[in-house]
């Protein structure tokens, strides 16, 4: 099957404090490969999650990763703050026989718009 | 049928105000997200401003933050844009589009309405 | 910000000829690419989105191709009705969302 990655939500609002789920679905776990969460493009993108076992603050993954034929990859972030605001990617990437992996597919992108704790 | 109707342009001298109006009809408005895009006389198209369905979300391009104020009335079905401090480079004409539900390209564009800033 | 580059500026050509025109990225974009036509008077239509998905009433003549930094729409056979002005549009890198400069293609 045609790999295929999606991101559904165009933005969300979230306030802050509040968490928020940044949702992102593959048609295809071929080639294989990790999918990374990244927000912003080009140099100055931030990686925010990768499905490979390492530890992010306030970012978990919304179903079990680890599951066959998983292709939810969906994340959480927790107590959002100002900061969080930007727009995340999900971008799947094909392992390459030496490092670097390299980017094959991405979602359209999610934007996270953080609005003021109502007081 | 789709159909965008902008209206509200005209000839201003620099320093002045005007306020365009997009009316919107053959789509549910406040579902969509909306943009005004202009092009000037013999130029390419240049994105303005972007405002979500709910109107919480907006974006302004760098030649126009702080000049202009993009809003919608959603019971009325129209969009407009604020252009205050007007300068001789904003001379165009001034699109309303409507954005894909799912992306951000623009499926439906009005005709278009000139805005000529000149003393 | 992403930058589109559309070339030629100007592409001359015959009814029923074939015109490509090209659409290069500063950075990956993915398959995140749309192309519009503008011809004077009239609203700037929607002819290809997703680099290579046709949008609804386009004529099969009109079709899109290219991925991550590199684009091309194609009309395979040109009809009177083409002769227009054709821009690419990205909207992986957003906002801001950034169009090309814009291809002419005129009678010859």
């Known amino acids: 099957k045609e790999l295929k990655v999606t991101q559904p939500e165009k933005s969300v609002s979230v306030a802050a404090g509040d968490s928020t789920v940044l949702n992102c679905t593959l048609t295809s776990l071929l080639p294989v490969g990790p999918i990374k969460w990244y927000r912003g493009v080009g140099q100055s993108r931030l990686l925010i999650y990768s499905f490979t076992g390492e530890h992010f603050p306030r970012v978990t993954n919304v179903s079990d990763a680890t599951k066959r034929n998983n292709m939810d990859f969906s994340i959480r972030i927790s107590n959002v703050t100002p900061e969080d605001a930007g727009t995340y990617y999900c971008v799947k990437f094909q392992k390459g026989p030496s490092e670097p992996d390299t980017e094959i597919q991405s979602g359209g992108g999610t934007e996270v718009y953080v609005l003021a704790k109502p007081s | 049928d789709v159909q965008l109707v902008e209206s509200g342009g005209g000839v201003v001298r620099p320093g002045e105000s005007l306020r365009l109006s997009c009316a919107a009809s053959?789509?549910?408005?406040?579902?969509?997200?909306m943009n005004w895009v202009r092009q000037a006389p013999g130029e390419g198209l240049e994105w303005v401003s972007l405002i979500s369905g709910s109107g919480e979300i907006i974006y302004y391009a760098d030649s126009v933050k702080g000049r202009f104020t993009i809003s919608r009335d959603n019971s009325k079905n129209t969009l407009y844009l604020q252009m205050n401090s007007l300068r001789a480079e904003d001379t165009a004409v001034y699109y309303c589009?409507?954005?894909?539900?799912?992306?951000?390209?623009?499926?439906?564009w009005g005709l278009g309405t000139l805005v000529t800033v000149s003393s | 910000e992403t930058v589109l580059t559309q070339s030629p500026g100007t592409l001359t050509l015959s009814p029923g000829e074939r015109a490509t025109l090209s659409c290069r990225a500063s950075q990956s974009v993915y398959t995140y690419l749309a192309w519009y036509q503008e011809k004077p008077g009239q609203a700037p239509r929607l002819l290809i989105y997703?680099?290579?998905s046709r949008a609804t009433g386009v004529p099969d003549r009109f079709s899109g191709s290219g991925s991550g930094t590199e684009f091309t729409l194609t009309i395979s056979s040109l009809q009177s009705e083409d002769f227009a002005v054709y821009y690419c549009q990205q909207y992986y890198d957003r906002p801001p969302l950034t169009f090309g400069g814009g291809t002419k293609v005129e009678i010859k």
């Open positions: 053959g789509f549910t408005f406040s579902s969509y997200d």
């Open positions: 997703g680099a290579s």
């Open positions: 589009a409507k954005e894909n539900n799912r992306y951000r390209f623009f499926d439906y």
